[in-house]
């Protein structure tokens, strides 16, 4: 009686059940009553990830320079190439097909995130008592200068954009 | 109990043809396909053609395409192997063989054939 | 077409001793070798199938192993009607190729 279904890592054709090819090799020619699944390995700049009976291999993945990509990691018959940004620029996509340059943080806003190759600068208001006074990909929200720690007053109060200022007690005569 | 049994071998002269016939039971016959090995004498083992259970699919190494055809009566439960155009080279003992789970399981006894003038 | 190497050509031991053959192939074929005994006079049998799985009714002493391009065929203590010759045929690819043989012989 032919077989309806087959194992793991099998397929049916001409009902009869042939193996897959592994990770790494395509599919050459089917099983026969005689003779296994005929499999070659995938060429150079070649892969094939999952058990399969593809004809052909897919092309490793191009990292373009031109998109400000470089390899993260090289693929391998068995692997794509993995794609990642420039330093400075992060991935426009999970696919990372192409790159855009890391967001900057406002005066007024803080990092709460540095960027990477894969997720942009995420940025954060300054709350009471920090400023940021610079556009920035990196720098946090400092904290207000503490003018009592330097037996200094307040002269002028900060504000989410500019530190306090600070200026020398009135003595009493 | 499975049962291989080869006909029809004999002395031939070269370029004359010859059928070879294959009896088989104790197993249904539509089931398997079937191949025809050779073993000249005192020599290895050579595999000459193979056909699919249900008889639409054949195989032949190069030296033997064109020149033998394998069939099969499945009514009859008999492999039948056609050679045209004999040489010297093909002088020996023929097996026919049933294949199960991809390997040569059972074999027949074999018929010699001999080409010689 | 993959060629099919055996060696030795022929064994000399005694019974009791332990005999390995070897089988080699030309590329990789994965476990796709079957292997044969052939006593004189006798047609092949099936000794081992998928390399390295047994065949029911083939006493235990009979074992293969091996993957890709390199195959052994061992019987761990031959007794008098092991003497023979023994093939490996592969079913990787078309053509199918046997290999010339390995005669086991009394020392």
């Known amino acids: 009686e032919p077989p309806t279904a087959c194992r793991e890592k099998q397929y049916l054709i001409n009902s009869q059940c042939c193996s897959l090819c592994q990770p790494g090799q395509k599919l050459v020619s089917d099983c026969t009553e005689f003779t296994e699944t005929e499999c070659l390995p995938c060429g150079e700049s070649e892969f094939l990830d999952t058990w399969n009976r593809e004809t052909h291999c897919h092309q490793h993945k191009y990292c373009d320079p031109n998109l400000g990509l470089r390899v993260q990691q090289k693929g391998t018959s068995e692997t794509d190439t993995i794609c990642t940004c420039e330093e400075g620029w992060h991935c426009t996509s999970e696919a990372c097909e192409s790159c855009v340059l890391h967001r900057s943080c406002s005066p007024g806003f803080g990092v709460k995130q540095i960027a990477t190759g894969v997720s942009d600068t995420i940025c954060e208001p300054c709350p009471v008592g920090f400023f940021s006074n610079v556009s920035s990909a990196f720098e946090k929200c400092h904290p207000w200068t503490s003018c009592e720690t330097k037996d200094l007053v307040v002269q002028q109060a900060g504000t989410n954009k500019t530190d306090v200022v600070c200026g020398p007690q009135d003595r009493l005569r | 109990e499975v049962q291989l049994v080869e006909s029809g071998g004999g002395v031939v002269q070269p370029g004359r043809s010859l059928r070879l016939s294959c009896a088989a039971s104790g197993f249904t016959f539509s089931n398997y396909g079937m191949s025809w090995v050779r073993q000249a004498p005192g020599k290895g083992l050579e595999w000459v053609a193979s056909?699919?259970?249900?008889?639409?699919?054949?195989y032949y190494p190069d030296n033997v395409k064109g020149r033998c055809t394998i069939s099969r009566d499945n009514s009859k439960n008999t492999l039948y192997l056609q050679m045209n155009s004999l040489r010297a080279e093909d002088t020996a003992v023929y097996y026919c063989?049933?294949?199960?789970?991809?390997?040569?399981?059972?074999w027949g006894q074999g018929t010699l054939v001999t080409v010689s003038s | 077409e993959i060629v099919l190497t055996q060696s030795p050509a022929t064994l000399s031991l005694s019974p009791g001793e332990r005999a390995t053959l070897s089988c080699r192939a030309s590329?990789?074929?994965?476990?796709?070798l079957h292997w044969y005994q052939q006593k004189p006079g006798q047609s092949p049998r099936l000794l081992i199938y998928y390399a390295s799985q047994s065949i029911s009714g083939i006493p235990a002493r009979f074992s293969g192993s091996g993957s890709g391009t390199d195959f052994t065929l061992t019987i761990s203590s031959l007794e008098p009607e092991d003497f023979a010759v023994y093939f490996c045929?592969?079913?990787?690819?078309?053509?199918?190729?046997f290999g010339q043989g390995t005669k086991v012989e009394i020392k």
């Open positions: 590329q990789s074929i994965r476990d796709n």
């Open positions: 063989t049933r294949a199960g789970g991809k390997a040569m399981d059972y």
């Open positions: 045929q592969q079913f990787n690819s078309w053509p199918l190729t």
């Open positions: 056909i699919s259970s249900g008889g639409d699919d054949t």
